[in-house]
């Protein structure tokens, strides 16, 4: 997250980190069910761990943390690597979470976002771009949904209805390491960090997010079919 601020503790209990060997963050994710996460389809890896209820990026033990293995990854059937359409994936955890103030699912919004809606994006991704700089703790950033026209104008021929754009003033954006993390609007999960300009946080180049309102049926049916 570029030019965000430290999230208040316990305010993002659905935020998950996907980790490689053994504590290397590579993507964010979102708890949407006691045993299921949503993340970006481009975050798919063969072997990874899931960390929930953790505030700092470092692997130091925190009393609220819960660790899991991802036992099943189900990318949306319309996703094709390395594109960004239909960029979502469900991950089944090896067991159900223990609900606490630090670990709790969030509902996926069935309403599509309207321009001007105020949202919050969060993650442990780089706080500088194009060079990489880690934050110490989870970062939060207020962003506003843009109209689909402004989105298409920013990224000609790259935007479809499975995406929406959101941003704020120049110099504020999600970035590398935030992929798959949540965009929360009005208390519901509206989007997932997907892509944006390279480097991040360029003027008039908003972040692009998976438009989850288009996928509520697939999410529900997939969870039911695999539970």
């Amino acid at each position: 997250i570029i030019n965000g601020s430290d999230c208040d503790m316990h305010t993002q209990p659905w935020q998950a980190a996907l980790l490689l060997r053994p504590n290397q963050l590579y993507c964010g994710a979102v708890l949407v069910h006691p045993q299921w996460l949503l993340t970006a389809a481009h975050c798919r890896k063969k072997v990874f761990r899931v960390r929930l209820g953790h505030y700092s990026l470092s692997p130091v033990y925190e009393s609220g943390q819960q660790m899991f293995q991802g036992v099943k990854s189900i990318p949306h059937p319309g996703y094709s690597h390395p594109g960004h359409s239909n960029d979502l994936m469900l991950i089944k955890l090896n067991r159900r979470i223990r609900p606490t103030k630090d670990v709790r699912p969030i509902n996926v919004s069935s309403h599509c976002p309207s321009a001007g809606t105020k949202c919050l994006v969060s993650g442990w991704g780089t706080t500088k771009s194009p060079q990489v700089h880690f934050p110490k703790v989870l970062q939060c950033l207020n962003i506003s949904v843009l109209s689909q026209k402004r989105c298409e104008d920013a990224y000609p021929r790259q935007i479809d209805d499975t995406m929406f754009c959101a941003g704020d003033k120049a110099g504020r954006d999600s970035c590398q390491g935030d992929s798959g993390g949540p965009v929360v609007c009005n208390g519901s999960l509206q989007g997932l960090v997907s892509w944006g300009d390279y480097p991040c946080a360029r003027p008039n180049r908003p972040g692009v997010y998976t438009n989850l309102c288009k996928f509520t049926k697939w999410i529900q049916e997939t969870i039911q079919a695999n539970s």
């Epitope: 490689l20 060997r21 290397q24 963050l25 590579y26 993507c27 970006a40 481009h42 975050c43 390395p82 594109g83 960004h84 991704g125 780089t126 060079q131 990489v132 920013a154 990224y155 000609p156 021929r157 790259q158 999600s174 970035c175 590398q176 390491g177 935030d178 992929s179 798959g180 960090v193 997907s194 892509w195 944006g196 300009d197 390279y198 480097p199 991040c200 360029r202 180049r205 692009v208």
Partner: antibody, heavy 124, light 107 residues
């Protein structure tokens, strides 16, 4: 299958501007999934990254070359270009263009497709 | 700038032997941001390993990468005749840089 092809003059005079073009075939530059790079290799030496460009036109340059480098993209021609000003003999090298995959995961996918390179000699 | 130092400069080995190439960074580099390339004379480099340990498409499993922090290793378990080449590490954690290369030659 994606292919990259560098083109441009093989000989440039000192103090002039070196101009090269990379033509992309079998794929499209206007893609949110990739960025495009220039790398060079002086004779008998190692590789040096020059800079990257995204299809939107946003750039990222090697700090040591930044004052002399301009990378641009022409999506209608499926090409991206390098200009290096005020060249000296030290800029004599094989110049490569390459492609890198891009997303917002915390991961570097490497430069997975390269052109075959074009030799540029700086001499009067 | 992050300087990558590769060693040895030249490695003289026979086909079938194991090759171990080292890449040391002047400051800590995330393993997710380290790659290895192979270059043969007169050819462009070819991506072998990305994310320090993931093999690129079509790369045989005799090539493996490991390491973290400042020390990274490329291992070729059993050298084939086509593996004799120059190998470069690259970091993209900050402004991208390449190591000076290790030449693997036939003994």
């Amino acid at each position: 299958q994606l292919q990259l092809q560098e083109s441009g003059p093989g000989l440039v005079k000192p103090s002039e501007t070196l101009s090269l073009t990379c033509t992309v075939s079998g794929g499209s530059i206007p893609s949110s999934s990739y960025y495009w790079s220039w790398i060079r290799q002086p004779p008998g030496k190692g590789l040096e990254w020059i800079g990257n460009i995204y299809y939107s036109g946003s750039t990222y340059y090697n700090p040591s070359l930044k004052s002399r480098v301009t990378i641009s993209v022409d999506t209608s021609k499926n090409q991206f270009s390098l200009k290096l000003s005020s060249v000296t003999a030290a800029d004599t090298a094989v110049y490569y263009c390459a492609r890198g995959e891009y997303d917002r995961s915390y991961y570097y996918w490497g430069l997975d497709v390269w052109g075959q390179g074009t030799t540029v000699t700086v001499s009067s | 700038e992050i300087v990558l130092t590769q060693s040895p400069g030249t490695l003289s080995l026979s086909p079938g032997e194991r090759a171990t190439l080292s890449c040391r960074a002047s400051q800590s580099v995330s393993s997710s941001y380290l790659a290895w390339y192979q270059q043969k004379p007169g050819q462009a480099p070819r991506l072998l390993i990305y994310g320090a340990s993931s093999r690129a498409t079509g790369i045989p499993d005799r090539f493996s990468g490991s390491g973290s922090g400042t020390d990274f290793t490329l291992t070729i378990s059993r050298l084939e005749p086509e593996d004799f080449a120059v190998y470069y590490c690259q970091q993209a954690f900050s402004s991208p840089t390449f190591g000076g290369g290790t030449k693997v030659e036939i003994k």
